[in-house]
Interface confidence: medium
């Protein structure tokens, strides 16, 4: 492992979708790629009038978007779909939105999965 | 070097069967999902199928659905497309490709392609 | 099953000229967007991944942007290897779907 750099070899795996496109529903996927690209794990969500709503979580492919994050952060303002990664083994088990434009102390918390989704 | 090559393309009447293969190589094969796109001349591409890394699940365009199976051998390091009541609208260059992890986020690597030409 | 829609579907340019595709998906697919190339009679090729990666090997005048629905594939310097179809793709769910392409021609 290169220093400083933590390894993501395996993510948290989720699909809502799990039906339609022929997958597990929730399990632990292990993340291959080529030796020298680096892997991340990734969460994204929905967030129906309160109602945290997680479309899918797994590896990620290199991206230089997620490099050095050992958290899963959202920093966009207030998108459809929320979409946050990072780096090291089921980094992805929380996932959190602290939008970039706010200037006070975020209100958001970190999102926790709960069952029966994610045991 | 990752390689992916199609073979098993041909000409075939309306209502036949054709079967593909793609042997793969340079890459752990069964580490992989794998996915079928296809080309009608002069056309765009169109997403025909998919499987996981262990045959386990499979997925299929509306458009095949019921005619096509995909399928794979990871000891022979192959993927296989059955098609069968072929109809003209099928004829295409048909590729096979790599999804680039377990859920297809890209396809990462791609065969020549092999023409199939449903004629009668 | 979510439209994929390419515009312009052709375009002229010279070499050195800076290049934009657009790719609106018909709803939002998050970063699960996908840039190929293809020339005349050859397999299409990964440019992009994610948006904005770029594949293994491919030069840093192709750049991707966007996120949500609206996505943009800029090549800062048109090379005269460059004249090919270009194609956008989701992978946000099945079934994966392209857009109708982009063929960029020699003016």
């Known amino acids: 492992a290169i220093l400083g750099r933590s390894e993501t070899q395996e993510c948290l795996f989720f699909n809502a979708n799990w039906e339609k496109d022929r997958t597990n529903q929730t399990g632990v996927e292990p993340c291959y790629g080529d030796k020298d690209k680096r892997r991340h794990c990734f969460a994204t969500w929905k967030n129906i009038s309160g109602s945290i709503e997680i479309v899918k979580q797994g590896c990620w492919l290199d991206d230089i978007n997620c490099y050095d994050r050992t958290d899963c952060v959202e920093k966009k303002d207030s998108p459809e779909v929320y979409f946050c990664c990072c780096e090291g083994n089921m980094c992805n088990e929380k996932f959190s939105y602290f939008p970039e434009m706010e200037v006070t102390q975020p209100t958001s918390n970190p999102v926790t999965p709960k069952p029966p989704y994610y045991n | 070097e990752v390689q992916l090559l199609e073979s098993g393309g041909g000409l075939v009447q309306p209502g036949g069967s054709l079967r593909l293969s793609c042997a793969a190589s340079g890459f752990t094969f069964d580490s992989y999902s794998m996915n079928w796109v296809r080309q009608a001349p002069g056309k765009g591409l169109e997403w025909v199928s998919n499987i996981n890394y262990n045959g386990g699940y499979t997925g299929y365009a509306d458009s095949v659905k019921g005619r096509f199976t995909i399928s794979r051998d990871n000891s022979k390091n192959t993927l296989y497309l059955q098609m069968n009541s072929l109809r003209a609208e099928d004829t295409a260059v048909y590729y096979c490709a790599r999804g680039a992890n377990w859920h297809d986020t890209a396809l990462d690597y791609w065969g020549q392609g092999t023409l199939v030409t449903v004629s009668s | 099953d979510i439209q994929m829609t390419q515009s312009p579907s052709s375009l002229s340019a010279s070499v050195g000229d800076r290049v934009t595709i657009t790719c609106r998906a018909s709803?939002?697919?998050?970063?699960?967007l996908n840039w190929y190339q293809q020339k005349p009679g050859k397999a299409p090729k990964l440019l992009i991944y994610a948006v904005t990666s770029l594949a293994s090997g491919v030069p840093s005048r192709f750049s991707g942007s966007g996120s949500g629905t609206d996505f943009t594939l800029t090549i800062s310097s048109l090379q005269p290897e460059d004249f090919a179809t270009y194609y956008c793709q989701q992978s946000y769910e099945s079934p994966l779907t392209f857009g109708g392409g982009t063929k960029v021609e020699i003016k």
């Open positions: 709803q939002s697919i998050s970063r699960y």
